[in-house]
Interface confidence: low
């Protein structure tokens, strides 16, 4: 037989020879970093057909590193599910906690003992410093100095000194988030007042009010014979402007008899949909007449006679 087989986990006892006689036996021992667990054989014999009898290093087990418990509020996840040397231990913190220390420890061989490459990390609770103070307003728990993960504060505005109240711009509630950062910027308190929305040939059908402060919502419809150019619903935004802009009501012109009939008039009706762009609520109640979709057909405001052949 030629030289006996080599293995990852065990090595030949003694020096290998260039050839071996039939019946000759060679013995193996577990390599450094491995330990033997009976009963599997760790020897082989040169067989009559000049091959070595089957042998494997399955009896040699890798040394394993000491048990590591899950960090409090986290997990220790052994790579490949093993504590054997050469493998890693990954540490993960639960939601609301962050890792202090090494995210990965390595099971290393020191002499013949497997030990971890460092100290296991700890999972520290996510803490936030107090949220920002805001002008003309305050937040709940203002006396608290340290906030824990998902702790929330709610802002409110002070009474205004003048006739118009302060409006809270932004989300009133913010919470202590993942990276010890508040979930969003603090809101602001300021006077927001939009102009009265005037629509010629139309009328406001909801959202009536003496004044239109932040987030005031108004809906419109056009008079008979007019169609709405723009959105039927507008909102007072933080810049004291209407969003979208106040719509217009444009006159519907009569169609030509030689062309596909145009809609004679369009009267806007009240919509319950606050988002005009939403298609989920079905057809919008106010729309432009379909005549403008036909090539060569005049737009309603251009007048029919001007473009006849």
């Amino acid at each position: 037989c030629e030289e006996p087989p080599t293995f990852e986990a065990m090595e030949l006892i003694g020096k290998p020879k260039p050839y071996y006689e039939i019946g000759e036996r060679v013995d193996y021992k577990c390599k450094k970093g491995y330990f033997y667990i009976p009963p599997l054989a760790t020897h082989t014999i040169c067989d009559r057909n000049h091959t070595w009898l089957p042998v494997s290093d399955d009896a040699c087990y890798r040394e394993t590193c000491p048990y590591i418990r899950d960090p409090l509020n986290g997990q220790a996840v052994p790579a490949n599910g093993t504590y054997e040397f050469g493998y890693q231990m990954h540490f993960i913190c639960n939601e609301g906690y962050y890792l202090i220390g090494e995210e990965i420890l390595y099971c290393e061989l020191k002499g013949s003992v497997a030990i971890w490459s460092g100290k296991p990390p700890i999972c520290e609770k996510v803490l936030c410093t107090p949220p920002p103070k805001i002008k003309n307003g305050k937040h709940t728990f203002s006396e608290v100095e340290v906030f824990e993960y998902l702790d929330a504060v709610t802002y409110s505005c002070d009474p205004a000194p003048g006739p118009d109240p302060f409006s809270l711009i932004g989300e009133s509630t913010i919470y202590c988030g993942d990276n010890s950062v508040w979930s969003r910027a603090a809101p602001e308190c300021k006077v927001v007042k939009c102009r009265f929305p005037v629509v010629e040939n139309g009328k406001q059908i909801s959202g009536f009010g003496k004044k239109f402060y932040y987030k005031a919502t108004v809906m419109f419809e056009c008079d008979k014979g007019f169609y709405l150019d723009g959105s039927d619903t507008i909102v007072c935004d933080s810049n004291s402007t209407w969003d979208p802009p106040v719509p217009k009501c444009l006159k519907v012109l009569p169609p030509s008899s030689t062309k596909p009939p145009a809609l004679s008039h369009s009267v806007s009706t009240s919509s319950t949909t606050k988002s005009p762009a939403s298609s989920a609520s079905g057809p919008r109640p106010t729309y432009k007449p379909p005549v403008s979709n036909y090539p060569g057909y005049p737009k309603p405001e251009e007048g029919i006679l001007d473009s006849l052949d």
């Epitope: 330990f35 040394e63 394993t64 000491p66 048990y67 409090l72 497997a114 700890i122």
Partner: antibody, heavy 118, light 107 residues
Framework: EVQLVESGGGLVQPGGSLRLSCAAS????????ISWIRQSPSRGLEWLGV???????NYNSAFMSRFTISRDDSKNTAYLQMNSLKTEDTAVYYC????????????WGQGTLVTVSS | AIQLTQSPSSLSASVGDRVTITCRAS??????LNWYLQKPGQSPQLLIY???SLHSGVPDRFSGSGSGTDFTLKISRVEAEDVGVYYC?????????FGQGTKVEIK
């Protein structure tokens, strides 16, 4: 060197409850991982559970439903609360400082005897 | 839970004798085994941790060996003060468990 002294043992009827204390002197109980171990002639040494310095706990599942380990840092004392006691819980109970975070026990107290009998 | 079985359950030796106690685990525990001695009327005391490491203050006549499932505690020359019950303990897996003990007496 911290010394641990167990107390609170005594005679209790089956089904009763008992709270054992483990007072630390010469050091802070919160600075050490504290295990509770019991010993009886019939069952030998049994590890009951541990409270770690960070306040986390691990239990021997055989006792988890009945035994609770806690700590009061202000009193510098660890506790073992035992409920629904059975006659087989009769044993000497030791509180034990875990050796530098490794699970070998180098600092045994003198133990406190708990007898469960009617 | 991992079971630890010690043998013999008791032995009697003369001062100066070599004493061997074995501890067998129900599954492989690598080298995560400790040995304790409980002298009469006292609490247990740590002798050896991690199979073969002597705890501070323990005389070097004590030695430990083994790996996997079979472990041995040897006292090279037993002395009168070595009487008591010897326990092995594994810590590879919760719950940590102890052997049933080996009682050593001096003839």
């Amino acid at each position: 060197e911290v010394q641990l002294v167990e107390s609170g043992g005594g005679l209790v009827q089956p089904g009763g409850s008992l709270r054992l204390s483990c007072a630390a002197s010469g050091g802070s109980v919160s600075s050490y991982d504290i295990s509770w171990i019991r010993q009886s002639p019939s069952r030998g040494l049994e590890w009951l559970g541990v409270i770690w310095t960070d306040g986390g706990t691990n239990y021997n599942s055989a006792f988890m439903s009945r035994f609770t380990i806690s700590r009061d840092d202000s009193k510098n004392t660890a506790y073992l609360q035992m409920n629904s006691l059975k006659t087989e819980d009769t044993a000497v109970y030791y509180c034990e400082r875990v050796y530098d975070g490794y699970p070998w026990f180098a600092y045994w107290g003198q133990g406190t005897l708990v007898t469960v009998s009617s | 839970a991992i079971q630890l079985t010690q043998s013999p359950s008791s032995l009697s030796a003369s001062v100066g004798d070599r004493v061997t106690i074995t501890c067998r685990a129900s599954q492989g525990i690598s080298n995560y085994l400790n040995w304790y001695l409980q002298k009469p009327g006292q609490s247990p005391q740590l002798l050896i941790y991690y199979t073969s490491s002597l705890h501070s203050g323990v005389p070097d006549r004590f030695s430990g060996s083994g790996s996997g499932t079979d472990f041995t505690l040897k006292i090279s020359r037993v002395e009168a003060e070595d009487v008591g019950v010897y326990y092995c303990q594994q810590y590879i897996k919760l719950p940590w468990t102890f052997g049933q003990g080996t009682k050593v007496e001096i003839k």
